[in-house]
């Protein structure tokens, strides 16, 4: 039994890091393998992650981590019984994929303005809380070409757009994702989408 593709990990910079790797043949990850991880810090304890299968030879492990900060570095040991298959390290702050924003809501009761709001996925004492920027994707269910991205580069998790920038009388969907420039993160997954019917009064033509 050998590791074909070494583990690569990403962190949500809050409580979970996800590691994926591939073996050189079909493997029952949960029964044959264990991923041990330990913070390089005074008094830290070793933890064991039981991997799950991710395709025939692929494995994935969700590492639970407390109080993740930028100085943290973890040692990783992949074991098959008594055999050490791979040894490495992982610094969560260098491989961040933020959590997806939540609670996306479209407020249509503001005169001819659409207000989209969502929730920051981090608590205020997490460093990413004040450093997320967002991309809002709006598209028409009727017209695949009517697809647009709005970049929200300010901290407030909201976006105002004129309803008239979208077509009236049809349904739209929106979703939002986040990233943080400070840690050079990847984009988060998209939030669940929300749907609304866009209608507004056409301006009266003289």
């Amino acid at each position: 039994m050998k590791v074909l593709q070494e583990p690569t990990c990403v962190s949500d910079y809050m409580s979970i890091s996800t590691c994926e790797w591939k073996m050189n043949g079909p493997t029952n990850c949960s029964t044959e393998l264990r991923l041990l991880y330990q913070l390089v810090f005074l008094l830290s304890e070793a933890h064991t992650c039981i991997p799950e299968n991710n395709g025939g030879a692929g494995c994935v492990c969700h590492l639970l981590m407390d109080d993740v900060v930028s100085a943290d570095n973890y040692t990783l040991d992949l074991w098959a019984g008594q055999q050490l298959l791979w040894k490495g390290s992982f610094k969560p702050s260098e491989h961040v994929k933020p959590r997806a924003p939540g609670n996306l809501t479209v407020h249509t009761n503001v005169s001819d303005t659409l207000l989209l709001t969502w929730s920051n996925p981090y608590p205020p004492d997490n460093y990413l809380y004040n450093h997320l920027t967002y991309a809002v994707n709006i598209w028409s269910e009727n017209d695949p070409a009517d697809f647009r991205i709005y970049n929200v580069t300010y901290l407030e998790p909201s976006l105002r757009i004129a309803a008239s920038t979208l077509k009236s009388g049809i349904s739209y969907r929106a979703r939002v994702r986040a990233w943080a420039q400070c840690y050079n993160t990847t984009w988060s997954e998209w939030s669940p989408s929300t749907k609304w019917h866009n209608s507004y009064r056409e301006p009266f033509e003289q």
């Epitope: 810090f41 304890e45 109080d67 900060v69």
Partner: antibody, heavy 116, light 111 residues
């Protein structure tokens, strides 16, 4: 919100022991390390030791080795710092502080006065 | 007692900029992250900067930190009377068992 509430001021005789408590609230108690530091009047900060509330393991500064004991009670989310064989130089404000490499949350401090 | 050296005092007028230095060695600042704490009279220290240059939520951007080699610097711009306090740098020392160490402290006076 995170709160670290420390016990009240103490006056002790030389040679006695003191036990200072630090009750945590507003977060998962066992998920965060707790440090103890002290500050003598008009002096700087001095690290004393650290406890991992999850398993109760500890590490102490060499200067306090053999005189300090840090414990925790997970049922009340409280950590304790006991310092024995007190001398006048131990007169200081004692702080608990939450964190690993740096400390974002501090208790208000407990003044321990050692005087005959 | 302190492994890190800071100037005992600095002063400047309101609105001005002031810098506080923190000098260490290869076994501490040179090998670890630096944090800075503000201690107002009669209160517990408060985290101002961590990870050399990052500010916790709620700390204004008038406060900034930097690190170069075995020394670190705290800069405060647009000085306010409320900034008058003691300032401490902190890091980890790995010369023996790893342990946190603090600077000697700097008293900031806003003239």
């Amino acid at each position: 919100q995170v709160q670290l509430v420390q016990s009240g001021a103490e006056v002790k005789k030389p040679g006695a022991s003191v036990k200072v408590s630090c009750k945590a609230s507003g977060y998962a108690f066992t998920s965060y390390y707790m440090h103890w530091a002290r500050q003598a009047p008009g002096q700087g900060l001095e690290w004393m030791g650290i406890i991992n509330p999850s398993g109760g393991s500890t590490s102490y500064a060499q200067k306090f080795q053999g005189r300090v004991t840090m414990t925790r009670d997970t049922s009340t989310s409280t950590v304790y710092m006991e310092l024995s064989s007190l001398r006048s130089e131990d007169t200081a404000v004692y702080y608990c502080a939450r964190g690993k490499w740096w400390w974002q949350h501090w208790g208000k401090g407990t003044l321990v006065t050692v005087s005959s | 007692q302190s492994v890190l050296t800071q100037p005992p005092s600095v002063s400047a007028a309101p609105g001005q900029k002031v810098t506080i230095s923190c000098s260490g060695g290869s076994s501490n600042i040179g090998n670890s992250y630096v944090s800075w704490y503000q201690q107002l009279p009669g209160t517990a220290p408060k985290l101002l900067i961590y990870d050399n240059n990052k500010r916790p939520s709620g700390i204004p951007d008038r406060f900034s930190g930097s690190k170069s080699g075995t020394s670190a610097t705290l800069a405060i711009t647009g000085l306010q009377t409320g900034d008058e306090a003691d300032y401490y740098c902190g890091t980890w020392d790995t010369s023996t068992t790893p342990m946190p160490v603090f600077g000697t402290g700097t008293k900031l006076t806003v003239l």
